[in-house]
């Protein structure tokens, strides 16, 4: 199963950690994809490690663990984020987070 905070908020200009927690007694994680709506942010694979999409390379830092740290947030970053865990032999598990970026006070 995937466990995640459904709704999170952060300040404009700040950073936020996007985290999905996968728990299974048997399945091993082989790949994790992170998307902002339909756009890929980063991908982790056991073979190749982390790769961050070039369009986000100055704002997205892999980690902690299989999560992402999203920096220099703008109001346009408000929206849905999806983690997809590819596991063996368990199959594919998805999690959803809604991020609300608020104006800095």
């Amino acid at each position: 199963t995937i466990d995640t905070k459904r709704n999170i908020s952060a300040e404009e200009g700040g950073s936020v950690i996007l985290q999905c927690h996968f728990s299974s007694d048997t399945a091993e994680v082989t790949q994790v994809d992170w998307k902002q709506q339909d756009q890929l942010l980063a991908i982790y694979s056991v073979d190749l490690g982390w790769h961050v999409a070039s369009v986000f390379s100055d704002r997205v830092v892999p980690g902690p663990s299989l999560g992402l740290t999203f920096q220099s947030l703008t109001m346009n970053d408000t929206g849905e984020y999806f983690c997809t865990y590819h596991t063996y032999p368990g199959g594919i598990y998805k999690g959803r987070i809604f991020l609300k970026v608020q104006e800095s006070s």
């Epitope: 982390w50 790769h51 070039s54």
Partner: antibody, heavy 119, light 113 residues
């Protein structure tokens, strides 16, 4: 400033062992995958081994698998390469190198330590 | 293992000239997961360790002068130096990141006339 400093190289005979060390500073060592890459005199670069940050996953080049062991001590910011049953073809400059967080390259290199295997 | 073939093996140019070197891989370096080509270029000056110049085939690494340009996709890649300077002398290596073991080309040696 990221710094990687290798040590432990030297002259040794075929069949003997050496242990290389790489001291890291200027970054959160425990968060990064680390590699050993070697370069024979006047030749190109050859990747040797890597060790992942959290998982400790390791991978070796065929030429060294079963003879070399990569390890790390995150508390002391140290990377190691234990080299056993050395052969003359292992003679090279050995570099430790850092993999950046977002792509499969080497963004920081040490100055290297020279290993010479000769009878 | 993926074989990386660089050409030419060496070249000599005068300061200010444009230089092009190529790197061919034995299989595609396109990673559909991240929609990037996993090809990097390094510069190694005599007596020094290599330095990362380009990653994802075309993105200049931090602090790399804009006279260095990477291009290409699939199996064919190019590094261009638009106006060569004396300090650009050295060896240039390409490296693939799509498969373990990671592999390098044999290098192109750039000499300044």
């Amino acid at each position: 400033e990221v710094q990687l400093v290798e040590s432990g190289g030297g002259l040794t005979q075929p069949g003997k062992s050496l242990k290389l060390s790489c001291e890291a500073s200027g970054f959160t060592f425990s968060s990064f995958t680390m590699h050993w890459v070697r370069q024979s005199p006047g030749k190109g670069l050859e990747w040797v081994a890597f060790i992942r940050s959290g998982s400790g996953i390791v991978f070796y080049a065929d030429a060294v698998r079963g003879r070399f062991t990569i390890s790390r001590d995150n508390a002391k910011n140290l990377l190691f390469l234990q080299m056993n049953d050395l052969k003359s073809e292992d003679t090279a400059m050995y570099y430790c190198a850092r993999r950046p967080l977002g792509h499969n390259t080497f963004d920081s290199w040490g100055q290297g330590t020279l290993v010479t295997v000769s009878s | 293992d993926i074989v990386m073939t660089q050409s030419p093996s060496s070249l000599a140019v005068s300061p200010g000239e444009k230089v092009t070197m190529t790197c061919k891989s034995s299989q595609s370096l396109y990673y559909s997961g991240v929609k990037e080509n996993l090809l990097a270029w390094y510069q190694q000056k005599p007596g020094q360790s290599p330095k990362l110049l380009i990653y994802y085939a075309s993105i200049r690494f931090t602090g790399v002068p804009d006279r260095f340009t990477g291009s290409g996709s699939g199996t064919d890649y190019t590094l261009t130096i638009t106006s060569v300077q004396a300090e650009d002398m050295g060896q240039y290596f390409c490296q693939q990141g799509i498969n373990n073991p990671l592999t390098f080309g044999d290098g192109t040696k750039l000499e300044i006339k």
